[in-house]
């Protein structure tokens, strides 16, 4: 009943809660003397489900047969007409649509560490959609049975409250659950387990790592446990990786030596337990311990290479390049690079340790024979030294490989392919491949990269510090025994027109024709390698095409002479550069007029 | 300090009903669980049923399971014992007894112990004639 029903009542039958599909007899009856006032004949009875009409009568009942009513909870509702007036409310009913409970699937109970309590869960099954109460019992030693009930909509957990003990853990216990509506009831298979089965132990807390003598070779494990664990599980990775390792162990005690351990790196840890061999599940995971394994010497060498420039006629500068140890090979953080210069016949020896550089420069005199040795160290000791005798790389114009090409090879990589050198080939021990930044003065002070290839290969794919539109100067070096020889070619990894041409700085007449002379473009408007430099001039005034003269690219090359001019005519000249990619735009312009003699 | 008062007691044929109450008064703030238990003449106490105060989780002997059925009005601290199918061996006094441990409930082992329960009425004779 919705209302105080003053006026009449609504009755339902069978029941106001019935079976989805099920039919429902509604009766709306008027109280004596409650009908209109005068009119008891002209009594318009009207039923509202919700707010739609879905049935009338004249006269003091009505009786109407409702049938496909859907899941939930539906409103009827009975009002009066009378002539002249408004509906009035006579009374009201709800009717609770569902169906009875399904049986409770996969009850599975746990109890979370030893002193954590009993809680159970369960599948409902589908909603009922009408008030449905679960009764979980528990069964077990002592014959007694524990029963707790859930009121909540939407049962699927309860906790019982009780803590197993292992006082005897092979007893069993059992549970069900049971759910009861006005519709019926059903309960769950039952789940019979022992103490064993269903405590879940806590995860290990406490985790710390110890290096004995700092060795990681000697690396144990501690952890805090609960008191009957049996077995656990250990995993651990380098931070950096996605993989774990596994290992699992029997009566540990908390305690386990790690013997793969790799020296200077950061792992992960963590622990799980259980308290059987093959009853009970495995706890959560633990926290994470993080720790850095202690460092060990550098193992491996170290990748070195080097120029040779001359200065005058005693002296020679080189310059000794070195890559850094993987962080396998430095095995910790390398401190210093201990450099050793050597003259060999006459045995001096110069050594200097280099910190915060992966190069170091000297001069040294043009005669004699010269060796380096160059090692990586650590707090624990150094790396073997890469020694290396200085000699002229270009010297062997026999070993020069042939052929050498570069090509844009996809996005910032340039494959550079090259021919055997006509020597014996077999005499190649190894080629290197040695790429830096074109920079106009021949800086010293750009960046030099290099890769070995083994000497079957006749091609390498430079992507190291390769950016677009810059040129690269590229060498390949054939390396046999004591004697080089080397190939050098300009390469980009992609191009465009330059953005600017050259900028003329000076005109200047000599014996009848002219020197011109420019500033080089801008490295980053270069766009590229540049193929050629154009010299442009006309007549000034004049609206004839202008004539032009194409200069091969020459790095060092900033100036050019130009004969064809005519004597007191006043010319304007400019420049242009090309890539393979195009022109660029005019560069200054200069008005010149030669003061000669005509011919 | 608490008072425990059984009543509801006396003959009934077997297969009939009774239910007992145990009302508590004076400190029932500190009620965490109550319980019943019976002696029957020439034997030993044992325990039937019990009932945790915080979340209504009940606890039955098998022997009693189905037929004694405990239950509680927190509102007025009474907790109470429908006795249905009675069997002449249901025959003795019946105890109403209480405990202030929070921890009652939590060990399966302790809750049927008389040990566990601090506080006992005097008892109420329950007869079931054949």
């Known amino acids: 009943k919705i209302d105080a029903c003053k006026r009449g009542d609504v009755t339902v039958k069978p029941s106001h809660v019935i079976l989805l599909g099920s039919t429902v007899n509604i009766t709306c009856s008027l109280k004596p003397r409650q009908g209109c006032f005068h009119y008891s004949r002209r009594n318009k009875l009207i039923l509202y489900k919700f707010d739609r009409r879905i049935n009338f009568h004249h006269g003091h009942s009505l009786n109407s047969q409702v049938t496909g009513l859907p899941l939930g909870t539906t409103l009827f509702v009975c009002k009066l007409a009378c002539i002249n007036s408004d509906e009035i409310q006579i009374c009201g009913a709800e009717i609770f649509v569902g169906v009875a409970p399904e049986q409770p699937q996969n009850l599975s109970c746990i109890q979370k560490g030893e002193q954590g309590t009993v809680a159970c869960t369960w599948e409902r099954g589908r909603d009922t959609h009408l008030y449905t109460e679960y009764t979980l019992q528990l069964s077990g030693p002592k014959n007694l049975t524990w029963q707790k009930q859930c009121k909540d909509i939407y049962c699927d957990y309860l906790d019982f409250g009780i803590n197993l003990t292992p006082e005897s853990p092979e007893s069993n216990f059992t549970a069900k659950v049971t759910a009861v509506n006005s519709l019926g009831s059903s309960s769950s298979l039952p789940s019979t387990f022992t103490f064993l089965d269903i405590v879940r132990p806590l995860p290990p807390w406490d985790i710390r790592i110890k290096f004995q003598k700092a060795s990681v070779s000697r690396c144990t494990l501690y952890w805090r446990d609960e008191g009957l664990v049996l077995l656990n599980r250990l995993r651990y990775r380098p931070s950096n990786s996605r993989l774990w390792n596994m290992v699992n162990v029997t009566k540990a005690k908390g305690r386990h030596d790690l013997l793969d351990l790799k020296p200077f790196t950061e792992y992960e840890f963590q622990i799980s337990s259980k308290l059987h061999l093959y009853k009970g599940s495995w706890s959560d995971w633990s926290e994470s311990l993080r720790a850095q394994t202690p460092e060990e010497e550098p193992t491996g060498m170290l990748d070195v290479w080097y120029m040779k420039r001359h200065i005058d006629y005693s002296r020679q500068q080189i310059s000794l390049f070195w890559k850094n140890l993987s962080v396998s090979e430095a095995r910790g953080k390398i401190l210093h690079y201990q450099v050793t210069l050597q003259e060999l016949t006459g045995g001096k020896a110069m050594t200097q340790n280099i910190t915060g550089h992966t190069s170091w420069t000297t001069v040294i005199p043009r005669t004699g024979n010269w060796a380096v040795a160059v090692s990586a160290a650590n707090s624990k000791g150094s790396s073997l030294p890469t020694r290396i005798n200085i000699m002229n790389l270009c010297e062997a114009g026999l070993l020069a490989p042939r052929q050498v090409s570069a090509n844009s090879e996809g996005m910032d990589n340039i494959l550079v392919t090259w021919q055997p050198p006509r020597k014996d080939p077999s005499a190649v021990q190894e080629y290197v491949v040695e790429w830096r930044e074109l920079h106009p003065g021949g800086d010293t002070q750009v960046p030099l990269n290099w890769l070995r290839s083994r000497p079957y290969n006749v091609s390498a794919l430079i992507s190291e510090n390769i950016k677009s539109y810059i040129c690269y100067e590229i060498r390949v070096y054939a390396l046999s025994g004591d004697q080089g020889g080397c190939s050098s070619i300009l390469g980009n990894s992609k191009h465009k027109a330059p953005l600017s041409g050259p900028h003329i700085n000076a005109i200047t007449e000599e014996k009848g024709s002219i020197l011109i002379s420019w500033n080089s473009i801008p490295v980053q408007e270069q766009m590229g390698c540049l193929l050629h430099y154009r010299i442009y001039w006309k007549e000034r005034d004049s609206n004839s095409q202008p004539q032009l003269c194409e200069i091969p690219y020459r790095v060092s090359q900033n100036s050019h002479p130009i004969n064809s001019l005519q004597p007191r005519v006043t010319y304007v000249l400019w420049m242009t550069a090309l890539t393979a990619a195009g022109e660029s735009s005019h560069g200054n312009e200069r008005e010149f007029c030669l003061q000669g003699k005509a011919n | 300090q608490l008072q425990l008062v059984e009543s509801g007691g006396g003959l009934v044929q077997a297969g009939g009903s009774l239910r007992l109450s145990c009302a508590a008064s004076?400190?029932?703030?500190?009620?965490?669980?109550m319980g019943w238990f019976r002696q029957a003449p020439g034997k030993e106490r044992e325990f039937a049923a019990a009932?945790?105060?915080?979340?209504?989780?009940?606890i039955h002997a098998d022997s009693v399971k189905g037929r004694l059925t405990i239950s509680r009005d927190n509102a007025k601290n009474t907790v109470y014992l429908q006795m249905n199918s009675l069997k002449p061996e249901d025959t003795a006094v019946y105890y109403c007894?209480?405990?202030?441990?929070?921890?009652?409930?939590?060990?399966?082992?302790?809750?049927?112990?008389?040990?566990?329960?601090?506080?006992w009425g005097q008892g109420t004779q329950v007869t079931v004639s054949s």
């Open positions: 004076g400190r029932t703030f500190g009620i965490h669980g």
């Open positions: 007894a209480a405990t202030s441990n929070p921890q009652f409930g939590r060990n399966w082992y302790t809750v049927a112990a008389g040990v566990e329960y601090g506080y």
């Open positions: 009932i945790r105060w915080s979340d209504g989780t009940t």
